[in-house]
């Protein structure tokens, strides 16, 4: 098969184009020329906003390491969005 | 195929710190999570939290937070994981292994001994 | 944290029977038609190897013998039918939320 199919059979008689993961899914296992892409879901911490037969989910951003706070929590859809933190004023 | 090599046993003092490494290969290593695990008494399983190559965001087990710190170098395509502050509690096999919902591929272990 | 509890701790299996690991969730790891729950093969001095991913998929690689199944608080990982090669340590693990934790392990002895 071309790059982007995969054999349906062993005899490899036909060949069909590689699944892609939808948005909340990540790629597992690439595909092969004989085997189909496998897909996981995104669990919690873990994000997929494409659809794609190569990319994995992705860890949500830390936003405590860049010294900022979770203004908007993530899904398996979204990542997380970071925002200043408040300061108490005088 | 997916190969993750860890660096060597090491044997240090209470109250040291030291650096583990584990060199990717086989993949494109900024588009994977690598989790760190730890097992003691050839038993015992712990997650210590995970860090992603592409920006460097990492996620630690709350037990772990002051113990370890994740790093990694994109242009080597190696992570890291310094121990700090080392008591003999600490000495175990130290994994990393890649992966976001179960861990799909592991190096092959790093024997961290503390003895004074 | 998500405390996983498996039973028994060891177990001894004559050769070509059936081998049953329970692994027990403090709360449910199963959402949106999906059990984040995967189980390991260990054998001393090795890394632990992957069987099982999100309850009952097997992992490349690994025997038909193998399979899991399980929702919610509640998995099993059955081997049938066992061979020597199966002697091992088994864990379960979960992707249900951070931190992930693992299972205490279950020895699998073959007679």
């Known amino acids: 098969c071309e790059e982007g199919w995969h054999c349906t059979s062993e005899a490899c008689e036909s060949c069909v184009l590689h699944r892609s993961c939808s948005p909340g899914f990540g790629v597992k296992q690439i595909a092969t020329g004989v085997s189909d892409t496998i897909c996981e879901p995104c669990p919690v911490g873990f994000f997929s906003n494409v659809s794609s037969a190569f990319e994995k989910c992705h860890p949500w951003t830390s936003c405590e390491t860049k010294d900022l706070v979770v203004q908007q929590a993530g899904t398996n859809k979204t990542d997380v969005v970071c925002g200043p933190q408040d300061r108490l004023r005088a | 195929e997916v190969q993750l090599q860890q660096s060597g046993p090491e044997l240090v003092k209470p109250g040291a710190s030291m650096k583990i490494s584990c060199k990717a290969s086989g993949y494109s290593f900024a588009d994977y999570t690598m989790n760190w695990v730890k097992q003691s008494h050839g038993k015992k399983l712990e997650w210590i939290g995970l860090?992603?190559?592409?920006?460097?965001?990492?996620s630690y087990n709350q037990k772990f937070k002051d113990k370890a710190t994740l790093t990694v170098d994109k242009s080597s395509s190696t992570a890291y994981m310094e121990l700090l502050s080392l008591t003999t509690e600490d000495s175990a096999v130290y994994y990393c292994?890649?992966?976001?919902?179960?861990?799909?591929?592991w190096g092959q272990g790093t024997t961290l001994t503390v003895s004074g | 944290d998500i405390v996983l509890t498996q039973s028994p701790t060891s177990l001894a299996v004559f050769l070509g029977q059936r081998a049953t690991i329970s692994c027990r969730a403090s709360k449910s790891v199963s959402t949106s038609g999906y059990s984040y729950m995967h189980w390991y093969q260990q054998k001393p001095g090795q890394s632990p190897k992957p069987l099982i991913y999100?309850?009952?998929n097997l992992e490349s690689g690994v025997p038909a013998r193998f399979s899991g199944s399980g929702s919610g608080t509640d998995f099993t990982l059955n081997i049938h039918p066992v061979e020597e090669e199966d002697a091992a340590t088994y864990y379960c693990?979960?992707?249900?939320?951070?931190?992930?934790?693992f299972g205490g392990g279950t020895k699998l002895e073959i007679k």
């Open positions: 860090i992603n190559p592409y920006n460097g965001g990492t």
């Open positions: 999100l309850a009952s």
């Open positions: 693990q979960h992707s249900r939320e951070l931190p992930r934790t």
């Open positions: 292994a890649e992966g976001v919902n179960n861990f799909a591929d």
